[in-house]
Interface confidence: medium
Amino acid sequence: KDSAPTVVSGILGGSVTLPLNISVDTEIENVIWIGPKNALAFARPKENVTIMVKSYLGRLDITKWSYSLCISNLTLNDAGSYKAQINQRNFEVTTEEEFTLFVYEQLQEPQVTMKSVKVSENFSCNITLMCSVKGAEKSVLYSWTPREPHASESNGGSILTVSRTPCDPDLPYICTAQNPVSQRSSLPVHVGQFCTDPGASRGGTTGETVVGVLGEPVTLPLALPACRDTEKVVWLFNTSIISKEREEAATADPLIKSRDPYKNRVWVSSQDCSLKISQLKIEDAGPYHAYVCSEASSVTSMTHVTLLIYRRLRKPKITWSLRHSEDGICRISLTCSVEDGGNTVMYTWTPLQKEAVVSQGESHLNVSWRSSENHPNLTCTASNPVSRSSHQFLSENICSGPERNTK
């Protein structure tokens, strides 16, 4: 027979039929089925099928009238070429039917990973996503949704390169993997999270630095007088996208909510397009980028704002230790500290004697006085960019007291 073999696909563990078109009234002498390596089965009318290969026992059957070959519990080893030799009664010529059997595994859910991000001109980003299915190598076709003009597929569809600006909508991309027996789709991937600093290092207005207080609200200014007439404003921070579209309330992408699942703490003012954050958290600190968009979704201008966040300082604690008291001179070491102050706290002591020694960011003070002199009353003031807090140290009865104390 000159025609190409019939291609049949089966699922690993499933069943498959290699069909023969033998009509009921055809008088058959016998049918021999030959497998990828050797003869498999012999069938004759009104007789039991003879199976010749051990590995097919219990998995192979030949249908009564059409003599089609049925294989169940398919293994990867079953794949290959099959041939049916059909011998009709009173018919000298043997008819042959050829088949090619492919056995495929059911696909698992495709995984999408970000391969690379390249920042290009005009504040745009080229993001390369890769789609793969665990355990599947051959015969897997990949496709992506949405199929956009500015997204290109390569490597048989498994790689998608998307070009986008912050002004483009952050669409969810879905990878669909397909083989002849199954089709699976990935979870949606928002590419906006991979491109949150396009062109930020090059150009745009160098915005100001804004100082905020932990737990309190803050406004990051954009100072767009005609904010209401702006098509769209997008603020980017880390993997968060906060946007305000014309004639619409400002919306925070689900990504922003991932930082605070209980409350939407971030929004864009419809008055001046500034970014407002309530109840500041330490992780809100960092560089923010604002992009003003045109109707055609291109970036018309960009501003950077750096947000610094500090705690309101609690009252400092003063600890002291007596170094030694002799010759009528009292010598002590003082240390001033603020709980949760962090490394941005500055300490000052007042009034400071000429011979006093201050060390370690001014938190430590060595001081001495004669018993004939007035006992110094010292004040430690802790300060950071958003607050100041003081504590007075009373030195009387120190030299006659215990070796260490806290005030």
């Epitope: 496709s143 992506w144 949704t145 199929r147 956009e148 669409l171 789709s185 949606p188």
Partner: antibody, heavy 116, light 106 residues
Amino acid sequence: QMQLQESGPELVKPGASVKISCKASGYTFTHYYINWVQQRPGQGLEWIGWIFPESGSTYYSEKFKAKATLTVDKSSSTAYMLLSSLTSEDSAVYFCARGTGFFDYWGQGTTLTVSS
Amino acid sequence: QIVLTQSPAIMSASPGEKVTVTCSASSSVSYMFWYQQKPGFSPRLLIYDTSNLASGVPVRFSGSGSGTSYSLTISRMEAEDAATYYCQQWSSYPPTFGGGTKLEIK
């Protein structure tokens, strides 16, 4: 046999809500996105949104964000669409359809009539 | 969103006649999909990825096009082809459909 079976016709009053169901069979329900499409009388087709049964994640067309809520029950392989604050404008046939990129299988449609 | 405009809106053809339905997109799309819908029934996928025939669709149907211009062709019209045909894109969100072309038999 791959099938999407939708719930029967609904007659509801303006202002009310309605929940339409779409029961899937013949394939692994959690592996495929379920989309919903509206067809108003004598009109064309309009996409409402999708839900991914495995995770429950959803995506809505801007037009239907405030109108439709999509959910699934994995145990019964059923997708649901809740339509709220109904007006006569919502009278239509609603189809569920499987797929991403295109819709390879469709439900038979549920006719919703909103009338006082 | 991308607007798909189909033409003609209504047309009739004799059995055996060649039929072409066009779909014009307001912005470039990468692929077009075509559906057939008969009265009282749900749509049926005919063509996917611009030119690939869906399972069970007769070979007299074909699709072509690129960019903003796409078409569906029936090489020889048959009585069972009388229906409304819709084009659809998913190159950008939201997915959109054309307004439909109603094809009648003469």
